[in-house]
């Protein structure tokens, strides 16, 4: 029995619903009484949802899963996962048994966009060319871990003297703090780009330091 799932991971935003697609080709005369469908976590084999003896056996996964009962007879064994969490990320196996059996695994990739970075400066007054300053770029509640890039006003990448830390909160979402230490020129714009590698989403923050005063666009 051939069971088909998408090759590419299913990307779902935290808090939204995701559909894990799975299909099979029913033979002529197929009835739901013959169908046994099991969704499980691939690695741990934990049961997620099942259908047997013509009946939806329900969710075994925090009551956040559902099948598409009206579509099962046409060979649609897809699973709806509600209110996606970071902890849901991973591989799900769709197992279908009729007269023969087959299975396939689909990957769920969870994502959350990063907030617009906030920029802070230390020290933040009486700055003169030649002073060393610490610029901190902070972006919150994203997933997965971000890629952080710094550049100056001319678009030249700044890679030295950058320290980036990422901490996961209780939901598994990351707060990113990236610190750039620079020696001030006469005028300077410093930009921080926080990229979500899954969503290909860029969040920008910048600070412009002019003799005095300073501006934070």
């Amino acid at each position: 029995l051939e069971v088909q799932v998408p090759e590419d991971p299913v990307v779902a935003l935290v808090g939204t619903d995701a559909t894990l697609c799975c299909s099979f080709s029913p033979e002529p005369g197929f009835s739901l009484a013959q169908l046994n469908l099991i969704w499980q976590l691939t690695d741990t084999k934990q049961l997620v949802h099942s259908f047997a003896e013509g009946q939806d056996q329900g969710s075994a996964y925090a009551n956040r899963t559902a099948l598409f009962p009206d579509l099962l007879a046409q060979g649609n064994a897809s699973l709806r996962l509600q209110r996606v969490r970071v902890a849901d990320e991973g591989s799900f196996t769709c197992f279908v048994s009729i007269r023969d059996f087959g299975s396939a695994a689909v990957s769920l990739q969870v994502a959350a966009p990063y907030s617009k970075p906030s920029m802070t400066l230390e020290p933040n007054k009486d700055l003169r060319p030649g002073d060393t300053v610490t610029i901190t770029c902070s972006s919150y509640r994203g997933y997965p871990e971000a890629e952080v890039f710094w550049q100056d006003g001319q678009g030249v990448p700044l890679t030295g003297n950058v320290t980036t830390s990422q901490m996961a909160n209780e939901q598994g979402l990351f707060d990113v703090h990236s610190v750039l230490r620079v020696v001030l020129g006469a005028n300077g714009t410093y930009s921080c780009l926080v990229r979500n590698p899954v969503l290909q989403q860029d969040a920008h923050g910048s600070v412009t330091i002019t003799g005095q005063p300073m501006t934070f666009p």
């Epitope: 029995l1 499980q40 003896e53 196996t93 197992f95 007269r99 023969d100 087959g102 299975s103």
Partner: antibody
């Protein structure tokens, strides 16, 4: 030619346990359903239980429930059948069998493992 | 639990003759019925699956038929190597559980 290679003959005391192994030389245990069938001397075939390794779910004939444990190690393509609280009537040849990928039919069989229970 | 009853217990025939082996289920088993051949000192060999489908490498003289509770294995013209014990087997839908009949011994007359 794919073969199921079973472990060697065992002699066991009543009350003890035996664990028989069955290695799939094709190395593709995951996509198969594995069954264990026994045959006492001069008797017929008796299905004991089976496992679908990809699910990790085993099920057993009512007669053996609570006394038999069937497991599978996908990394080594080996299935195991452990029978506990042995008695003399458990003396039999124990076979493992499987179908082709996705098939429940028992079209490939091991050569059998003789387990003798004697005090 | 479904019980399979095979008849006759022993069948004595000569090479070249037609053999008809019967298997009756205590309740309907749908199409999940197979037949196995076993020779002394050997593991069983699948002959027929899903009532009437010949397994790989099985000669055309073996055929299966039936539905519901009554099933038949027919060997159209017996060859010397066909004398053996034959078992019918049923599989439940889910979970997959199996039952064998008690066997029919086909012996040379």
């Amino acid at each position: 030619q794919v073969q199921l290679q079973q472990s060697g003959a065992e002699v066991k005391k009543p009350g003890s346990s035996v664990k028989v192994s069955c290695k799939d030389s094709g190395g593709t245990l995951s996509s198969h359903a594995i069954s264990w069938v026994r045959q006492a001397p001069g008797q017929g075939l008796e299905w004991m239980g089976g496992i679908i390794p990809i699910l990790g779910i085993a099920n057993y004939a009512q007669k053996f429930q609570g006394r038999v444990t069937i497991t599978a190690d996908e990394s080594t393509s080996t299935a195991y059948m452990e029978l506990s609280s042995l008695r003399s009537e458990d003396t039999a040849v124990y076979y493992c069998a499987r179908g082709g990928p996705g098939s429940y039919h028992m079209d490939v069989w091991g050569k059998g493992t003789l387990v003798t229970v004697s005090s | 639990e479904i019980v399979l009853t095979q008849s006759p217990a022993t069948l004595s025939l000569s090479p070249g003759e037609r053999a008809t082996l019967s298997c009756r289920a205590s309740q309907s088993v749908g199409s999940s019925l197979g037949w196995y051949q076993q020779k002394p000192g050997q593991a069983p060999r699948l002959l027929i699956y899903d009532v009437s489908n010949r397994a790989s490498g099985i000669p055309a003289r073996f055929s299966g038929s039936g539905s519901g509770i009554d099933f038949t294995l027919t060997i159209s013209s017996l060859e010397p190597e066909d004398f053996a014990v034959y078992y019918c087997q049923q599989r439940s839908n889910w979970p997959p559980m199996y039952t064998f009949g008690q066997g029919t011994k086909l012996e040379i007359k």
